[in-house]
């Protein structure tokens, strides 16, 4: 009866809109409802625009499907025509009263069926049952594997591939691990698997900076150092590097008015010339202060060096040298003097001799023909020359003597003249000013060091070479070498250092072979008023430390590896160093800083003297050590 | 014994030129500086010029710079000074004094501490129209 | 150029006095000072050298003190033959500059 009806209502539509054309009143006869004349009459007011009298305007255009005026018309009322639903997504389409019902394929959803369900974010099935990865695809889904893995017959499974299996040289010299989905290349740890040369090789770890200052990168690892010359040390972590610290504080203050004569190792301090009225007589007038036993304390000369005076000191005692064209003499006589207390000394040309006074009691009278200095042009002119000779004298001496001196003067009155001209001039530079309080020993400030050549070789000793040290040592810091053999290769064959302990406030001794620690003394309070004292015997086959202390040692094995090493450097040339290394190699050894305290050296029954040294950094203080920081109430 | 003599002096009208000499004995010129100093009637010393040892070097005060000219000849042991275009303010007692460096010191750097410690009794230019 | 100011311009003092004359530089002139003693128609003598030193054969109570701009010559003692006219003047650079003088007269 439906499709009767609908067959009427096209006869009627032909006959009323398409043979005659109808308004709406017309059209609604035919549709008996207004639903469907609502939905008809603007689109068969469309239709009549595209096809009358041939006018193709923007309206027709949506008409083209349509070869004539009546198949535009007659498809109207067809909901389904043309197609509202999506193709891809609709099974059918059924007409309705100026609507239209889509009926959608599976997988898909929506009035026209316009959307695609995503199974994989179903949450009644959660990733669409898949156990990998869900791939949502138009109106269905599938599931798929990483990478590594193959999908089971279930579809929706996956399993690990063993890569290391199926291809044995997957990773040429390296380990292949089969990891889940992967595999992985391994190598040893400080190494770096290469794809194209599929093999191992080393990572530069200093390249990625890794360390805070110095780095060594070596076959599967690093070190890093620190610059122990500039005052630092490496921190726990390895990597970083911290201050060498103070852990015993020195009265370091300084005074202008005191001239140290130690300044330069090898050279004159202070040069005076006097031109002086001819009625004018040689007179040095000073307070003097040294531990020293040897050294120039003044050389005065004339002009054309053809007459000298000598002040010096020898056996801790003044000793007087003079050379003139009427007299060569030498004289010591009076106290010892190198007690470390102020003793004013005053040399003065009388008229026939020359008075030596100690805390103004007579203590020499050198007899003497003629003036001293032969005055020229109306003036007296006199050279007067400071803890050391202008240049090579000693032939012209009468005695020779080692001019190193580490002494202080204060008060000098030369010529009479007073310090005038001359103190000002000190106080300027800093260096040259003396400490205000010292003890007796040698100071390594922490910037540098002494050289010694020493033959250890002992021909009635059947071991051959043997190294017999004992150390007296109060360190003002806690990391330092304080005594180190260095072979013309320059290696580091034996070192005696110390380094700040793990545990709070003490340090370790350490020795070495090289950069291997052979032997730690641990966990010593050393930064204390009182001096520590170490004492040990080296020679080819062992090394034994005569201080009873808690040792940690390396194996016996490893023991003697090590000595065998020190043995084939002592067969060479080796240079011995003081307070810390020259220029090697700053992985030479554990430690490079520069050792910082007081410290006394005596090797195989010899006490060594800074003075005698080859070279010594000008900053040592050979016989003068600051005395340790008294807090005062203000400080 | 040590000193110097001066000579030259005399009087001389506006725009004219004298020269004075300094002859020393009792040592060699040639290890020392000399200067010229004057002393105006009732006036304090007025350093005129100086000149080094071997005449490398001269110095004037600035009234003076242009006209006066310091000159030495160590072979004669004398000073000169050649004053042209005298005005009446250069009317003085001029000294020759030797500049000695009495004390030296090297200590990083020379410092030399000078002072005039010969002097001759002078000698008097006049300069009046 | 360095300028010298002495003062006073004159003093009058006893034997046996003790008298300072002060000497002031317009800038630093470390030490480099030097006093001379000038008697009515002689040449000036020098006293001392470098601030503080004393030239052989003066006798020792004359001294100098100071440094940098401030200068002293001080007479311990004054002896009839020290009435003079006193002199500083600087050698620490060209042109050499002396001060204006003081003189010493019997009281």
């Known amino acids: 009866a439906n499709s009767m009806l609908e067959e009427t209502k096209q006869g009627n539509l032909e006959r009323e809109c398409i043979e005659e054309l109808c308004n709406k009143e017309e059209a609604r006869e035919v549709f008996e409802n207004d639903p469907e004349t609502d939905y008809f009459y603007p689109k068969y007011l469309v239709c009549l625009r595209s096809f009358q009298s041939g006018l193709f305007t923007a309206a027709r255009q949506s008409t083209d499907a349509y070869p004539d005026l009546r198949s535009c018309v007659n498809a109207i009322p067809d909901q389904c025509s043309p197609l509202p639903c999506n193709e891809d997504g609709y099974m059918s389409c059924k007409d309705g009263k100026a609507s239209f019902t889509c009926t959608c394929k599976p997988g898909w959803q929506g009035e026209k069926c316009e959307f695609d369900i995503n199974e994989c974010k179903d949450p009644s099935n959660i990733n669409g049952g898949c156990s990998q990865i869900c791939d949502n695809t138009p109106g269905s889904y599938h599931c798929s594997c990483k990478s590594g893995f193959v999908m089971l017959s279930n579809k929706k499974d996956c399993k690990d591939v063993d890569e290391c299996s199926l291809k044995p040289n997957m990773c040429g010299t390296a380990v292949c691990k089969n990891i889940p989905g992967d595999f992985e290349c391994e190598c040893p740890e400080g190494y770096r698997y290469n794809l194209k040369s599929k093999s191992c090789e080393d990572v530069d770890e200093c390249s990625e900076n890794m360390c805070a200052q110095l780095c060594v990168n070596y076959p599967g690892g690093y070190t890093c150092y620190c610059d122990g010359k500039k005052g630092f040390k490496l921190a726990q972590d390895q990597k970083s590097c911290e201050a060498v610290s103070v852990c015993l504080p020195l009265n370091l203050d300084t005074k202008y008015e005191l001239l140290y004569l130690a300044e330069q190792f090898a050279g004159v301090v202070l040069y005076l010339k006097f031109r002086l009225p001819e009625i004018s007589r040689f007179s040095a007038e000073f307070d003097f202060r040294t531990y020293d036993s040897q050294g120039v304390i003044l050389y005065a000369e004339s002009i054309d060096h053809s007459a000298w005076l000598l002040i010096a000191l020898r056996g801790g005692k003044i000793e007087v040298q003079l050379k003139n064209e009427h007299t060569s003499k030498i004289t010591t006589g009076g106290d010892i003097i190198n007690n470390g207390l102020w003793n004013m000394v005053s040399v003065e040309e009388l008229e026939h001799s020359i008075s030596i006074k100690i805390a103004k009691e007579a203590v020499m009278d050198i007899n003497k023909p003629g003036p001293l200095f032969k005055p020229e042009n109306g003036l007296l002119e006199t050279k007067v020359y400071f803890a050391g000779f202008p240049r090579k004298v000693e032939s012209e001496l009468i005695k020779p003597i080692n001019p190193r001196l580490d002494g202080c003067i204060r008060s000098w009155n030369l010529m009479k003249q007073g310090a005038s001209g001359i103190k000002e001039i000190i106080q300027e530079k800093q260096n040259k000013h003396c400490l205000v309080t010292v003890e007796k020993g040698s100071y390594y400030p922490g910037s540098g060091i002494a050289e010694f050549h020493i033959d250890y070789n002992n021909g009635s000793n059947a071991e051959g070479w043997h190294i017999n040290v004992t150390l007296n040592i109060r360190p003002s810091m806690g990391t330092g070498v304080m005594l180190a053999l260095v072979s013309s290769n320059n290696t580091v064959p034996f070192a005696v250092s110390l380094v700040d302990s793990t545990s709070e406030k003490s340090q370790d001794i350490v020795i070495s072979v090289e950069n291997t620690v052979i032997y730690r003394i641990q966990a010593l309070s050393l930064c204390s008023n009182q001096r520590s004292h170490l004492e040990f015997r080296v020679n080819r086959n062992n090394l034994e430390l005569l201080t009873p202390l808690k040792i940690e040692t390396i194996s016996q094995e490893e023991l003697q590896t090590q000595l065998a090493i020190l043995d084939k450097a002592m067969k060479g040339k080796v240079a011995t160093y003081l307070g810390g290394l020259p220029d090697v190699p700053f992985s030479a050894t554990p430690v490079n800083a520069f050792y910082n305290g007081c410290m006394e050296v005596n090797i195989n029954g010899v006490e060594l003297d800074l003075d005698e040294a080859i070279s010594k950094h000008n900053d040592i203080r050979a016989h003068s050590c600051p005395s340790v920081w008294k807090k005062t109430k203000n400080s | 014994e040590v000193q110097v003599v001066e000579s030259g002096g005399g009087l001389v009208q506006p725009g004219g030129s004298l020269r004075l000499s300094c002859a020393a004995s009792?040592?060699?010129?040639?290890?020392?500086?000399m200067s010229w100093v004057r002393q105006a009637p009732g006036k304090g010393l007025e350093w005129v010029a100086n000149?080094?040892?071997?005449?490398?070097?001269?110095y004037y005060v600035d009234s003076v710079k242009g006209r006066f000219t310091i000159s030495r000849d160590n072979a004669k042991n004398s000073l000169y000074l050649q004053m042209n275009g005298l005005r009446a303010e250069d009317t003085a007692l001029y000294y020759c004094?030797?500049?000695?460096?009495?004390?030296?010191?090297?200590?990083?750097?020379?410092?030399?501490?000078?002072?005039?410690?010969?002097w001759g009794q002078g000698t008097t230019v006049t300069v009046s129209a | 150029d360095i300028q010298m100011t002495q003062s006073p311009s004159s003093l009058s003092a006893s034997v046996r006095d003790r008298v300072t004359i002060n000497c002031r530089a317009s800038?630093?002139?470390?030490?480099?000072l030097n006093w001379y003693q000038q008697k009515p128609g002689k040449a000036p003598k020098l006293l001392i050298y470098?601030?503080?030193s004393l030239q052989g054969g003066v006798p020792s109570r004359f001294s100098g003190s100071g440094s940098g701009t401030d200068f002293t010559l001080t007479i311990s003692s004054l002896q009839p033959e020290d009435f003079a006219t006193y002199y500083c003047?600087?050698?620490?650079?060209?042109?050499?500059?002396f001060g204006q003088g003081t003189k010493v007269e019997i009281k």
């Open positions: 003047q600087q050698s620490y650079s060209t042109p050499r500059t």
């Open positions: 470098a601030a503080s």
């Open positions: 009792g040592f060699t010129l040639n290890s020392f500086w």
């Open positions: 800038q630093s002139i470390r030490s480099y």
């Open positions: 000149i080094k040892e071997d005449g490398s070097e001269k």
């Open positions: 004094a030797r500049e000695t460096d009495i004390l030296t010191a090297y200590y990083s750097d020379y410092y030399s501490y000078y002072g005039m410690d010969v």
